[in-house]
Interface confidence: medium
Amino acid sequence: RTVPPMVNVTRSEASEGNITVTCRASSFYPRNIILTWRQDGVSLSHDTQQWGGVLPDGNGTYQTWVATRICRGEEQRFTCYMEHSGNHSTHPVPSGKVLVLQSHW
């Protein structure tokens, strides 16, 4: 069986002038997947991305994520590329309000 992933891209404040963009793929099967950030249509090198492992999500399917830090204003140059079971898609960084993540002590 093949279950295609649901892909979701989010952005969050990282530091002044920078944002972290995260691409999440969920509810997919089998577990083999390519998920990577591209800049100007080219995959970023491994040392500029952070990956979560491919983990079971409890429903017999899998989930994973990849994140990278980019300069605010360059969002249009970045897309998340996903390849799974012979299908592929690209997903842009959402525009609009930046989600500010705050730590509550």
Partner: antibody
């Protein structure tokens, strides 16, 4: 081994057009972003244009924007530069280069031998 | 646009002696991913340019280890520990951080 061979240069009058080609071999062309770089006689290097592997991202230097068009045919392993409304200041050797800045490697690691474009009346 | 400057523009060197070329950018080339997008190229007489250093301090494949790159966000240095006759040519720095990519004016290294 990797080879990039430019062609299509020559003498053209101001306002005229030329189409440069770059034939690539020795590597998987469709995986590489490409750039055109030019060098006026006796001068330094100037980046002209960039195209992503799939052709979906394209950038130009302000000096050529609206006059030059970069394109590629991955089936033919070829890169092109259509140059319209040519000016005397476009006179240069034009180099075709690979662009690998994101591969954990380096940028513009392969260059062609260049093709000379001369714009003169 | 990011402006790149180099000094000196001409550098006569005795074979076996060290050489140093400076490059400056009008804006920091340090990306938020912690890479510094500064490159060094050498164009030997009558040849196409070839890459020497990528991301400020990484030696490109096949380049002799007498070459090294260093720097910070806006100030960069290319060093040759012992100049050889084959090192003659024009050295260019280039920023690859943002469009348009821009080169320095070049430093011509010649043998005394």
């Amino acid at each position: 081994q990797v080879q990039l061979v430019e062609s299509g240069g020559g003498l053209v009058k101001p306002g005229g057009s030329l189409r440069l080609s770059c034939a690539a071999s020795g590597f998987t062309f469709s995986n590489y972003a490409m750039s055109w770089i030019r060098q006026a006689p006796g001068k330094g290097l100037e980046w002209v244009s960039y195209i992503s592997p799939g052709g979906d991202y394209i950038y130009y230097a302000d000096s050529v924007k609206g006059r030059f068009t970069i394109s590629r045919d991955n089936a033919k392993n070829s890169l092109y530069l259509q140059m319209n409304s040519l000016r005397a200041e476009d006179t240069a050797v034009y180099y075709c280069t690979t662009d690998r800045r994101h591969y954990g490697s380096y940028a513009m690691d392969y260059w062609g031998q260049g093709t000379l474009v001369t714009v003169s009346s | 646009d990011i402006v790149m400057t180099q000094s000196p523009l001409s550098l006569p060197v005795t074979p076996g002696e060290p050489a140093s070329i400076s490059c400056r950018s009008s804006k920091s080339l340090l990306h938020s991913n912690l890479n510094t997008y500064l490159y060094w190229f050498l164009q030997k007489p009558g040849q196409s340019p070839q890459i020497l250093i990528y991301r400020m301090s990484n030696l490109a494949s096949g380049v002799p280890d007498r070459f090294s790159g260093s720097g910070s966000g806006t100030a960069f240095t290319l060093k040759i520990s012992r100049v050889e006759a084959e090192d003659v040519g024009v050295y260019y720095c280039m920023q690859h951080l943002e469009y348009p990519f821009t080169f320095g004016p070049g430093t011509k290294l010649e043998i005394k």
